[in-house]
Interface confidence: low
């Protein structure tokens, strides 16, 4: 087989690769960096001009079972006087993550990777004004 | 581990917890959601705490491309379009799970990896520390 060019995303398949049935992939769910912690500024969800709350969703057939979702508290943004300014908008910021879904079909169990869209917080934006002719 | 409800009629030999290694179907559910934040919204430009998006590419990871946010300013943009340093732009960080090829370069063998990404920025009131 030809050796791939540098910068190419096609590698030789090492002979040491584990055998995997067609249509499947082997996934070790022992998480690398499991104990890594988020080091965000303190209480930014309540100090933000677009504050948000957190909700924990729990699903025993999902790994990880807990996924935290943020919800913006206001439609507008909080101004210097602590009042809601509806000339600005609080909007959600979202990020994809992967989860493993466990599916039961009768007594057999299968596993499926799933992309989940997580709302991680909110930001304050200038609204887009649509002018009607 | 995570306890899984089991059909009471199934044999007891089934493990209630997620096993350490699983065989996963290659088709990722919801895989076609938009992964490029520049295409999905322009919040990064319209925010009072705007950010730039930096492409982080790693062929040994899935997804191979992740976009990292970097706040453009220390302060926030005020109504006049100027930077107000009485407020702070701070990154919103999130732990996400990705797949890491293990062993390296193998096409269909992965391990879950937790990585920390900055997703965007938000404008906050600063914490003022008064020195006695």
């Amino acid at each position: 087989r030809k050796i791939p060019k540098v910068g190419h995303t096609f590698f030789q398949k090492p002979e040491s690769c584990p055998p995997v049935p067609g249509g499947s992939m082997k996934l070790d769910i022992g998480i690398i960096n499991e104990n890594q912690r988020v080091s965000m500024s303190r209480n930014i969800e309540s100090r933000s001009t677009s504050p948000w709350n957190y909700t924990v969703t729990w699903d025993p057939n999902r790994y990880p079972s807990e996924v935290v979702q943020a919800q913006c508290r206001n439609l507008g943004c909080i101004n210097a006087q602590g009042k809601e300014d509806i000339s600005m908008n609080s909007v959600p910021i979202q990020q994809e993550t992967l989860v493993v879904r466990r599916k039961h079909q009768g007594c057999s169990v299968s596993f499926q990777l799933e992309k989940v869209l997580v709302t991680v917080g909110c930001t304050c934006v200038t609204p887009v004004i649509h002018h009607v002719q | 581990g995570i306890t899984i409800p089991r059909n009471p009629g199934c044999p007891n030999s089934e493990d209630k917890n997620f096993p350490r290694t699983v065989m996963v179907n290659l088709n990722i559910h919801n895989r076609n959601t938009n992964t490029n934040p520049k295409r999905s919204s322009d919040y990064y430009n319209r925010s009072t705490s705007p950010w730039n998006l930096h492409r982080n590419e790693d062929p040994e990871r899935y997804p191979s491309v992740i976009w990292e946010a970097k706040c453009r300013h220390l302060g926030c943009i005020n109504a006049d379009g100027n930077v107000d340093y009485h407020m702070n732009s701070v990154p919103i960080q999130q732990e996400i799970l990705v797949l890491r090829r293990e062993p390296p370069h193998c096409p269909n063998s992965f391990r879950l990896e937790k990585i920390l990404v900055s997703v965007g920025c938000t404008c906050v009131t600063p914490i003022v520390h008064h020195v006695a």
Partner: nanobody, 122 residues
């Protein structure tokens, strides 16, 4: 810029066979794949093949029935489809890749043909 043109689609009865072809012009790629989209559904991975033709990957739903192959001298990709089922009805697309990475993810394919319709019905 690579151009991809699929052909060989059509109406076939359940249990029948079809052979799809995809003619590539322009730059040749290490890997290519077939993906399909049924009405109202997401585009899904069917099969992929490395540049040399040594490595092939199949979706569970087509394994043992479909065979992907390529003829590099003709710059052509093929999909031999046997034992067709009604659920195989879809528009089939040929697409290029920078490698056999994440073959199952439609977002990882770079160039797409216009598609060829396969209808399996009695």
């Amino acid at each position: 810029e690579v151009q991809l043109v699929e052909s060989g689609g059509g109406l076939v009865q359940p249990g029948g066979s079809l052979r799809l072809s995809c003619a590539a012009s322009g730059r040749t790629y290490d890997a290519m794949g077939w993906l399909r989209q049924a009405p109202g559904k997401e585009r899904e991975f069917v099969a992929a093949i490395s540049g040399s033709g040594d490595d092939t990957y199949y979706a569970d739903s087509v394994k043992g029935r479909f065979t992907i192959s390529r003829d590099n001298s003709k710059n052509t990709l093929y999909l031999q489809m046997n034992s067709l089922r009604p659920e195989d009805t879809a528009v089939y697309y040929c697409a290029t890749r920078r490698g056999l990475y994440y073959v199952w993810d439609a977002n990882d394919y770079e160039n797409w043909g216009q598609g060829t319709l396969v209808t399996v019905s009695s």
